[in-house]
Interface confidence: low
């Protein structure tokens, strides 16, 4: 029996310190 696989869409925002502590830029999270 196949399991339904969840699809995670990335959410991208301009953010400071979100993806890297010293970087401002687009940061994408699923």
């Amino acid at each position: 029996r196949r399991r339904r696989r969840d699809t995670h869409f990335p959410i991208c925002i301009f953010c400071c310190g979100c993806c890297h502590r010293s970087k401002c830029g687009m940061c994408c999270k699923t």
């Epitope: 400071c16 310190g17 890297h20 502590r21 010293s22 970087k23 401002c24």
Partner: antibody, heavy 122, light 107 residues
Amino acid sequence: QVQLVQSGDEVKKPGASVKVSCKASGYTFIKYGISWVRQAPGQGLEWMGWIGAFNGNTDYARNLQARVTMTTDTSTSTAYMELRSLRSDDTAVYYCAREGWNDDYFCGLDVWGQGTTVTVSS
Amino acid sequence: EIVLTQSPGTLSLSPGERATLSCRASQSVSSNYLAWYQQKPGQAPRLLIYGASSRATGIPDRFSGSGSGTDFTLIISRLEPEDFVVYYCQQYGSSLTFGGGTKVEIK
């Protein structure tokens, strides 16, 4: 051009405090973090801590966190490092450096100040 | 805290020779987070290599970096007179740490 200019050399007595400034120019100050690094005479480099210019978040080296405070003034594009309860072994050259990032790469400390010599002596 | 050990402490070579500097980490470091610096006497350090192998702006191509995991290497393919100075590796993991440095001196 991109540069960091630090305040002048200091002579302090044990137990006193010192505050070193680091003025940035040639780039958008709030888009980068600043690390502080020191170097005792004849010794290697010691990372002291970091501050995010855009939000004031800090990360201090464990051995210094009780005595150090890092701040920024975004209106003048200046970072500050204050070290309290000075001891003779705090005698060193103190550097500020810009922390660079590019995508998923830590691009190193890519711009450095000229250094500020702090001498602690009675 | 990740400890970086550089070897040898001092490297004695002649101009034109190849220098191989080693940096070993006490635990695995992402290659993306490993950098090398050069420091001349009385000057601030200068960034040479970031991301273990990417040359910083203005760095001559005689400098190259490699490695992954816990073992990283800086190679200077042909030593010029101005290369006889001190080199440091640095990692950024949970916090920043530097290696103890390698001094490259004229034999």
